[in-house]
């Protein structure tokens, strides 16, 4: 039974040209995390793997930095970066936990950070839902 919850930075906004930290935290489970994937809609942004460390997708290398921790820093934001981001925690023995963050990139200086929210264990994605994600990243 999956008992964990993922806390994320929730709905956030940032200014065009600025940077933002995407952060998730898995808690309330003693499952051990073996890999964390960061995805934007259907694109893989980055992987933090227990054995191999961080891997940033080539198309995002210039604008994505690993950390802090298991989080991800997006730099030189554009309006096209607006959208959903997912942190996907691969754990043993629980399986996969997924957290969602919505980022809105604004032209003006009205950007504000939204409140944190929690995604309960019910928001769960099986590895089979993502057949092409993260394959070949573990050794």
């Amino acid at each position: 039974m999956m008992t964990g919850t993922i806390e994320t930075t929730g709905n956030i906004s940032a200014e065009k040209g600025g940077s933002i930290i995407l952060q998730c935290h898995l808690s309330s489970t003693t499952a051990q995390v073996t890999q964390v994937n960061w995805e934007q809609q259907d694109q893989l942004l980055a992987i933090c793997n227990a054995d191999l460390g961080w891997h940033i997708s080539p198309s995002f290398k210039d604008r994505v930095a690993p950390g802090p921790g298991l989080g991800l820093t997006l730099q030189s934001l554009t309006v096209n970066d607006t959208g959903e981001y997912f942190c996907i925690y691969h754990t043993y023995p629980d399986g996969t936990y997924t957290g969602r963050i919505f980022l809105e990139v604004l032209e003006s200086s009205v950007a504000e950070h939204g409140a944190r929210f929690q995604i309960p264990t019910g928001d769960y994605k099986d590895d089979d839902d993502k057949p092409n994600k993260g394959s070949g990243t573990t050794s």
Partner: antibody, heavy 119, light 113 residues
């Protein structure tokens, strides 16, 4: 150079409390998970507490659960272990140890601080 | 809890000897998802903190001499010192980091014959 320096050990009576500290330097403390591991006199090693990089997760073995609390202050590069309701069997050298994210072995250890629980 | 059993508990050896220490776990330490064995080996000298030697069962930590090697998978693991040096006389511990609570073997003391 990575350095972990424990302090706060000493003699305490059964049922008493003690707070251990670990000062970290030479690395980005907030990017690492941390644990406390103890070693009773002449005995082996026993892991007693874990805290994640941001302090969101803490785990304990049953032997100390409910009595020990691990915490950290990333702004001060410091790790703590609050020990309550101490027992004679808690007598040990207590080490703080660093863990790389997603790896759960201990890659650096402090020199240890001695806790003696005795009346 | 996963029990870790080391053998022998102590051994006497001479400089230049090949030394083998075994560690058995009560359940498999192999993760199928990444094919990694979650086992580490440490060396501890009297009055000193433990020092990491090997992780993932067979990966040598940076700076550890090549005479130290780890092997094994699943539940059976071995630490080998190919040619014992004077500075290698110490206590050696295995540790599983596969599941909470993380547990250590009882230790193997390597003494001078």
């Amino acid at each position: 150079e990575v350095q972990l320096v424990e302090s706060g050990g000493g003699l305490v009576q059964p049922g008493g409390s003690l707070r251990l500290s670990c000062a970290a330097s030479g690395f980005a403390f907030s990017d690492y998970d941390m644990s406390w591991v103890r070693q009773a006199p002449g005995k082996g090693l026993e892991w007693v507490a874990y805290i994640s990089d941001g302090g969101y997760n803490t785990y304990y073995p049953d032997t100390v659960k409910g009595r020990f609390t691990i915490s950290r202050d990333n702004a001060k590069n410091s790790l703590y272990l609050q020990m309550n309701s101490l027992r004679a069997e808690d007598t040990a050298v207590y080490y703080c140890a660093r863990q790389i994210l997603l790896r759960y072995y201990f890659d650096y250890w402090g020199q240890g601080t001695t806790v003696t629980v005795s009346s | 809890d996963i029990q870790m059993t080391q053998s022998p508990s102590s051994l006497s050896a001479s400089v230049g000897d090949r030394v083998t220490i075994t560690c058995k776990s009560s359940q498999s330490l192999l993760y199928s998802s990444n094919q990694k064995n979650y086992l580490a080996w440490y060396q501890q000298k009297p009055g000193k903190a433990p020092k990491l030697l090997i992780y993932w069962a067979s990966t040598r930590e940076s700076g550890v001499p090549s005479r130290f090697s780890g092997s094994g998978s699943g539940t059976d693991f071995t630490l080998t010192i190919s040619s014992l040096q004077p500075e290698d006389f110490a206590v050696y511990y295995c540790q599983q980091y596969h599941s909470y609570p993380w547990t250590f073997g009882g230790g193997t003391k390597v003494e001078i014959k």
